[in-house]
Interface confidence: low
């Protein structure tokens, strides 16, 4: 239904502290190098312009689109030749042209400085002095790392935010209090913040047909007792809220999810029995809940699949009918009927049966010729069982830093181009599938492993794309969305590979290594890990294991030292010179 | 066969505009990046600008930096560069060549350039 | 001021080996492929040597390239008459975020 002011229509759907919050958002997932307060007060005045909208909707410029009305604010900034580049011709373009041209400047590895943690003291004092500020400050600060964050999402995590500081600033010891809560939402967000990237990768590099099928894969193992018609409702919705969302409609997606949440909940009966918690909840944690609910109990006595897709008469004739609802029903029937095999893994299968299709059905005897496509499917079944099954059994053995290191000399061979920090970030991720899912009974382990290697490697896909420099990736990203991951498993050492010149500075290390925490330790020997395979991409796992631990008991023994600088650069420089005799270099 | 031309080069006074395109034709143009290269009288190569697959990603020489403007129109297998602001010191044979299906590929196929003249 | 580095010009006869030196920084050639190109008056440029040492498709033999650590090389061995161009090196800069050149080598042939 048209509105006479789309920003009047917002601005009374979602309240004013909602609107606000995902202007905010939205502008500092544009602008992200822009100012706390410059943004601060480009929001102030769209809310205080969207008041007036409400006041009078016939106003002057309140029937604009909000692409148009966010679109001419931010174009307002006077340094945006300056910080942003050509990123400013995009204020020369008309809309749509203008939202897409800022939309492809979005970066996903800004050039932005860590976020450091004050002292529990210092944040409670900043949090009791400006509450809205200091809220404000972490809304921008999220957002303008994570310019796909799913902006609704970041309004539950600011009230999880909020909540803590309330409670822990009043503890006895708030910091055993907050650190934990705050480690506990950093870790969430990143994670969260990975999940969404692929989502819209998904549907800005595949289209809207690849997201629908993820979603009517995972919807169905979600709600196996809900119809396919429900499912195919939700999926429609689903894609709306994240299509809107990736695009930058942070207002619209907002609106949008609080409507399907309550449609949800009005229609929980024929949906799922799991939902009945979520549902009692606020608006945000009853979206966050639903997003999250475990999967409903399968129906029992669920026909074989064969009777409908393989051995009627009609596969053919109701193929032709409606391609895409029957490959959908095909998806849903078999995901309701296996919560044990990840989305990835079905969506895979789906499309050996669409191949399998478009080959019969025009064959002489369509019936003879798919028979026996099930059987196709067992090779494609058993290589994702067969990985993980080998994976954990090298976690439990290895310990997680030990796998991730083994994974990064893989990881290192296969695609050496990569950037050094991009390979360390990408294969500490990958090795955390261990400790998140190795610990998981058979039934769970691939839809927790494989779908979660899809996140990280797309986070691998949307780096690499920035600055491409390795072909290898390019075309496991580019090829199929569903078949990157066994693309990567598949690949061998590049032989192609010159390896990095031998430069004793990259292992040149001082005593600072021996404040940093355990974790910033650990990065700093993985990316000499990888810098040693960069130059040495032969060597074998006794040749890296013997230079590491040199290197680990090095840095402890330095650590010890009364006067460390100088053991760092004497042992140093023994250090290089034995893993150059080592590796042969 | 792989076929690059350039067209609207020109004489221009400085300060000037002008906008070139390369018509591509005999490979899938929408797969590889795409480059702008230029050579100044009596001087070597010199690299202008670079487009990604998509038009998402877009690098440029310092020289250039926010007076160039590189684009491509995937359904129309066509290169764009748009100069505005134009110096003396852009007077250059402009070379539109197609990259690889990285930003670092060779330059596997050249047009056969378009004069462009700066000069009141 | 070109980024990589060659040699301006270079001469030598017919049937001889030649080599031309390209020298740039761990943020160009150390850490990216080098490509060079061959350019004739008049004509546009030519890929000739790419990804290091791959040569584009109907280069002759003759022609190779190879690279160690933050400096490239083209080879030419027997040279003829027709070789006689620029010849130019390239690859990308990671701290430029760009593509760069060398300043070009004159090759005559005696």
């Known amino acids: 239904d048209a509105h006479k002011s789309e920003v009047a229509h917002r601005f009374k759907d979602l309240g004013e502290e909602n609107f606000k919050a995902l202007v905010l958002i939205a502008f500092a997932q544009y602008l992200q190098q822009c100012p706390f307060e410059d943004h601060v007060k480009l929001v102030n005045e769209v809310t205080e312009f969207a008041k007036t909208c409400v006041a009078d909707e016939s106003a002057e410029n309140c029937d604009k689109s909000l692409h148009t009305l966010f679109g001419d604010k931010l174009c307002t900034v006077a340094t945006l030749r300056e910080t942003y580049g050509e990123m400013a011709d995009c204020c020369a373009k008309q809309e749509p042209e203008r939202n897409e041209c800022f939309l492809q400047h979005k970066d996903d590895n800004p050039n932005l400085p860590r976020l450091v943690r004050p002292e529990v003291d210092v944040m409670c004092t900043a949090f009791h002095d400006n509450e809205e500020t200091f809220l404000k400050k972490y809304l921008y600060e999220i957002a303008r790392r994570h310019p796909y964050f799913y902006a609704p999402e970041l309004l539950f995590f600011a009230k999880r935010y909020k909540a803590a500081f309330t409670e822990c600033c009043q503890a006895a010891d708030k910091a055993a209090c907050l650190l934990p809560k705050l480690d506990e939402l950093r870790d969430e967000g990143k994670a969260s913040s990975a999940k969404q990237r692929l989502k819209c990768a998904s549907l800005q590099k595949f289209g809207e047909r690849a997201f629908k099928a993820w979603a009517v894969a995972r919807l169905s193992q979600r709600f196996p007792k809900a119809e396919f018609a429900e499912v195919s409702k939700l999926v429609t919705d689903l894609t709306k809220v994240h299509t809107e969302c990736c695009h930058g409609d942070l207002l619209e997606c907002a609106d949008d999810r609080a409507d399907l949440a309550k449609y949800i909940c009005e229609n929980q009966d024929s949906i799922s029995s799991k939902l009945k918690e979520c549902c009692e909840k606020p608006l945000l944690e009853k979206s966050h809940c639903i997003a999250e609910v475990e999967n409903d109990e399968m129906p029992a006595d669920l026909p074989s699949l064969a009777a409908d897709f393989v051995e009627s008469k009609d596969v053919c004739k109701n193929y032709a009918e409606a391609k895409d609802v029957f490959l959908g029903m095909f998806l849903y029937e078999y995901a309701r009927r296996h919560p044990d095999y990840s989305v990835v893994l079905l969506l895979r299968l789906a499309k050996t049966y669409e191949t399998t299709l478009e080959k019969c059905c025009a064959a002489a005897d369509p019936h003879e010729c798919y028979a026996k496509v099930f059987d196709e499917f067992k090779p494609l079944v058993e290589e994702p069982q067969n990985l993980i099954k080998q994976n954990c059994e090298l976690f439990e053995q290895l310990g997680e830093y030990k796998f991730q290191n083994a994974l990064l000399v893989r990881y290192t061979k296969k695609v050496p181009q990569v950037s050094t920090p991009t390979l360390v970030e990408v294969s500490r991720n990958l090795g955390k599938v261990g400790s998140k899912c190795c610990k998981h009974p058979e039934a769970k382990r691939m839809p927790c492993a494989e779908d979660y290697l899809s996140v990280v490697l797309n986070q691998l896909c949307v780096l690499h794309e920035k600055t491409p420099v390795s072909d290898r990736v390019t075309k496991c990203c580019t090829e199929s969305l569903v078949n990157r991951r066994p693309c990567f498993s598949a690949l061998e050492v590049d032989e192609t590979y010159v390896p990095k010149e031998f430069n004793a500075e990259t292992f040149t290390f001082h005593a600072d290594i021996c404040t940093l925490s355990e974790k910033e330790r650990q990065i700093k020997k993985q990316t000499a890990l990888v810098e040693l395979v960069k130059h040495k991409p032969k060597a074998t796992k006794e040749q890296l294991k013997a230079v590491m631990d040199d290197f680990a008991a090095f840095v402890e023994k330095c650590c010890k030292a009364d006067d460390k600088e100088t053991c760092f650069a004497e042992e140093g420089k023994k250090l290089v010179a034995a893993s150059q005799a080592a590796l042969g270099l | 066969e792989v076929q690059l031309v350039e067209s609207g080069g020109g004489l221009v006074q400085p300060g000037g505009s002008l906008r070139l395109s390369c018509a591509a034709s005999g490979f899938t143009f929408s797969s590889y990046w795409m480059y702008w290269v230029r050579q100044a009288p009596g001087k070597g190569l010199e690299w202008v600008s670079v487009i990604n697959t998509s038009g998402g990603s877009t690098y440029y020489a310092d020289s250039v930096k926010g007076r160039f403007t590189i684009s491509r129109d995937n359904a129309k297998n066509t290169l764009y560069l748009q100069m505005n602001n134009l110096k003396s010191e852009d007077t250059a044979v402009y070379y539109c060549?197609?990259?690889?299906?990285?930003?670092?590929?060779?330059?596997?196929?050249w047009g056969q350039g378009t004069q462009v003249t700066v000069s009141s | 001021q070109p980024v990589l580095n060659q040699p301006p010009s270079v001469s030598g006869s017919p049937g001889q080996k030649f080599t031309i030196s390209c020298t740039g920084s761990?943020?160009?050639?150390?850490?990216?492929?080098v490509n060079w190109y061959q350019h004739l008056p008049g004509t546009a440029p030519k890929l000739l040597i790419y990804?290091?040492?791959k040569r584009a498709s109907g280069v002759p033999d003759r022609f190779s390239g190879s690279k160690s650590g933050t400096s490239a090389s083209l080879t030419i061995t027997e040279l003829q008459a027709e070789d006689e161009a620029d010849y130019y090196c390239?690859?990308?800069?990671?701290?430029?975020?760009?593509?760069?050149f060398g300043g070009g080598t004159r090759l005559t042939v005696l």
């Open positions: 390239s690859s990308w800069d990671d701290s430029l975020s760009g593509l760069v």
């Open positions: 060549a197609k990259g690889g299906l990285v930003v670092a590929g060779g330059l596997g196929s």
């Open positions: 761990s943020s160009n050639i150390g850490d990216n492929y």
């Open positions: 990804d290091n040492t």
